[in-house]
Every structure is written in C-alpha cells, then in structure tokens.
C-alpha cells in the first residue's frame, strides 16, 4: 500500500478510508502543484488509470464515484496534467478498504486440557470482515467482579495461574472494527466443570486364538481424574459405519477391553473420554489399527445376531461417518441402540 | 477503588525519548489489560499502545517502532518508552485500564503533559 507518500495536494474519500463493502464512494483529489494549471486530472485504482465517472470539479479538485464498491483493498492515486511536463505529476495516493461490520462471535467455549495449565476459549468468527478486526476475551470472575481481558483472533489460551483468584467466571468475546463492535453470549464457566482428561491412547490390540476369538484393545491415560467415562469406536477399514461402546474406566491401571469382531478384517479403533458427568470430551484418540486373525472354523457367523451376546449395562450404538476421508466428523446413523456384550471370558471392560 | 497516577512527562526535541510511568492502585495490576492514550491540543482521544491481561502488546500505525509499553507487576506500574520523538507526538498522555477497543478502557488519572519542540 501507500504508506508514507509525498503529496502535494490532498485526496480524501467519502464515506471514509474503511468503509462498507458495497457502498458506493467518492474519492476527492486536490491538486495543490507550484507552477502547474493541470489541463487533466487522473485517477488510479492499482496503479491502473480510470477511465469512467471521473468529474472535474473545479480547476483544483476532481472527483472519481464507484457504485457499490466492494473490494476490499485499494491503492489509489491520482495525478496532474501539466502543460510543458511529458510525465504526469503525482498529487496524493490513499489506501482504502472496504470490509463488513463484525457479527457477533457464537459458539464460545471454554476447556481446559488436563496438565496444561492453560483455560482455552475458542469461537466462531462468522463471516469475513476483510478489515482489521479485534477480538477481546473478557474473563470476569464472579467473586471479586475482577475482570481480565485478552486479544486475540479466534482463540486464546490464558494460563490458570492467572485464575487462581475465583473458580467462577463470566467469559464473553467482544469483535471490533471501525465498521462496528458485537458482543459474543456470556458463558459461565466453573474451572472444575471444564477439565478435558488427559490424552487415551490405545497401545496394543490382539487377537485370541479361542474357538471364538476375542479381540482385547488395551488402552491407557495420565489422567489424575478420578471418574472418568469413555467412548471407544470401530469399524472396518471398508465400512462407513462405526459401533461405539461406552465405558466406565479407571485409569489407575491399563484398560482392557473385549471385543467379538469379524475375523480376517482390518479394524480402525478409536477412544475419546470425559470427565463422568461433564460435557466436554477428549478429541477422538488417533486411529489404531489392528487386523482381525484368519477364522479355524467354517462358521460365518454375524456379531450383531451372535448367539456369545447378552444383555449387560454397556452400551453399543451405530454411528457413520459423512466421509471415509473424514473420520474424525460423525454422526448419529440411529436412534438404535443394541446393548450387548460377550456371555464367555472374563468381562474387563469396565475398569 | 482504581487509582492512576502518571509521571514523566516534560519537554523534549524531535528525536529525544522520554518515559512514561503509570502509577496504579486498587485492582489486581498484574492480570489487568492497561492502554495509554493520548489528547492532542485540539482533539479527541486516540489510544496510543495497550497490553492485555496475557502480555500481547498492541501499537498505534502512528509509534509503532518508536514506543514500547510494559508492566512491572513487582511496582504495580505500567510504563510507556517513546524513542525518536515527533511535534505530532505532542499531547497529554493517560493511562487507563482495559484494553483500546469496544468500549472497555476507562481512565482515572490527571494525565502527563508532553510537548515535542526544537
């Protein structure tokens, strides 16, 4: 852009330098030239002379009109005509912008991941503004009414040592440009009620060898939270659908859990857990693969109508993906939920 | 209540420094945004620099390169060093808290008198 440039003259624009994407505007050139009667004044947009709606105001001062501007940045400058000089004489040049008010930020909310010492807030910007936009976290505490506040642009992390005075906060995000300022909802947040636990991690898998095999997914967490609730899913690799099962675990020891699958197939497995009783959840833990060993007898038998099932607390359900490259987005396939697990072995799936 | 106090103002030539402090009282300073601003004779206020309650500092076009704003949590003191001074830098500079934008700083104190002349 034009930062620092040496006019002699003056350029202005109305409505403004950052205006409304859409308006339209008049860009005003002055010429203020020692020894020089401009025969012409002219207009650039990007260093591109302008050929239309330019008007000669007086013998000073012209004037370019954009209808419905909508780009959102420009360089423009303008020049002098002036007899005897072969070259035009540059005036005055003004970067200008257009962009949109800021919608008001939606969707806040606020984590903290188990040993970082950190609270994350994240939100949701809305539409482009295509200007310089602020956003401001202001995070109130509920006992002392001391409000802190933060800049940042669409998530900020802000280190619990710096709440250590209240467990109750009132946190909201404030967008600001020069088009216009909103406010996000106000979110009460309890630092106890918003701790993610540390990251599950499944280790190993295996295959038993029985008449029929079981497959045990061992898996672990760092988690210093006591009662923990979790969500293992899988599928085929060939499958869109993925079976969740629900688990109680206590982390104090690897989890083992077993599982009654197809044999000779390639599973994706995957955990995610959350405080018991609380509403945020782990991101889903990375994919483990694991394949199925090859099937001894003649059998083709079906998991879902397998006569190993019995009715227990667990909880298994169908969820598919939209995408197979996507399968970290799921959904709800059902409001079908088969409760079942395995009659034989020793049930280890709940901690 | 909130209480600031600034100090450090005088008179300076164009390319002489100067340092501003900001004397605050009633509020936990450490975990608080602070912003100082400025009233040119004649004018509104324009904020000048802010630093949020993270310590992300923030610069007006205008001093960015030349003005450098920071707290010292230990003297409950906000301090603004203005390098390569300008006459348009001329004004009487407040202290306040809260960050620049949206509505939310507010300022207490008297304020501090510079004046940039050869």
């Known amino acids: 852009g034009i930062t620092s440039i040496n006019c002699s003259g003056d350029m202005w624009v109305e409505p403004g330098e950052i205006f409304q994407m859409g308006m339209n505007v008049s860009i005003y050139c002055q010429e203020a030239l020692k020894h020089c009667r401009p025969r012409n004044l002219y207009f650039y947009k990007n260093g591109f002379k302008e050929e239309f709606d330019i008007t000669r105001i007086n013998r000073t001062t012209a004037r370019i009109w954009y209808k419905g501007f909508s780009e959102p940045h420009a360089y423009m400058h303008c020049t002098a005509e002036c007899p005897g000089h072969f070259q035009e004489t540059l005036i005055c040049g003004k970067d200008i912008s257009s962009g949109h008010p800021p919608d008001a930020p939606s969707n806040l909310t606020c984590v903290i991941y188990e040993y970082s010492g950190n609270m994350t807030c994240t939100w949701n910007t809305g539409k482009p503004t295509y200007i310089d936009t602020k956003y401001i976290v202001h995070v109130k505490s509920l006992e002392t009414e001391e409000e802190q506040q933060y800049l940042a642009s669409s998530y900020v992390k802000i280190s619990t040592d710096s709440l250590q005075g209240s467990r109750k906060y009132l946190v909201w995000v404030q967008a600001v440009n020069s088009l216009g300022m909103e406010n996000s909802q106000q979110l009460h947040v309890h630092l106890d009620d918003i701790v993610i636990p540390s990251a599950s991690i499944i280790s190993r898998a295996e295959t038993t060898n029985d008449t029929v095999p079981k497959t045990i997914v061992y898996w672990k967490s760092k988690t210093m939270i006591e009662k923990v609730f979790c969500e293992m899913r899988y599928k085929t690799t060939t499958n869109q659908t993925w079976s969740v099962k629900e688990f109680d675990a206590n982390f104090t020891y690897v989890q083992q859990s077993e599982f009654y699958l197809e044999p000779d197939s390639k599973y994706v497995f995957q955990v995610r857990c959350q405080e018991t009783g609380k509403r945020n959840w782990q991101p889903w833990s990375s994919p483990f693969v694991h394949q199925t060993s090859q099937e001894t007898g003649k059998r083709n038998w079906q998991p879902w109508s397998s006569p190993f099932v019995h009715q227990t607390s667990q909880t298994v359900s169908q969820v598919t993906a939209k995408s197979s490259h996507e399968p970290q987005k799921m959904e709800m396939l059902s409001a079908t939920i088969f409760r079942g697990h395995p009659a034989s072995g020793n049930h280890q799936d709940i901690g | 209540q909130v209480q600031l106090q600034e100090s450090g103002g005088g008179l300076v030539q164009p390319g002489g420094s100067l340092r501003l402090s900001c004397a605050t009282s009633?509020?936990?300073?450490?975990?608080?945004?602070m912003t100082w601003v400025r009233q040119a004779p004649g004018k509104g206020l324009d904020w000048v620099s802010g630093i949020d309650s993270g310590g992300t500092t923030v610069y007006a076009d205008s001093v960015k390169g030349r003005f450098t704003i920071s707290k010292d949590n230990a003297k409950n003191t906000l301090y603004l060093q203005m390098n390569s001074l300008k006459t348009e830098d001329t004004a009487v500079y407040y202290c306040?808290?809260?960050?620049?934008?949206?509505?939310?700083?507010?300022?207490t104190g008297q304020g501090t008198q510079v004046t940039v002349s050869s």
């Open positions: 009633g509020f936990t300073f450490s975990s608080g945004a």
């Open positions: 306040a808290t809260g960050l620049p934008w949206g509505n939310t700083w507010r300022t």
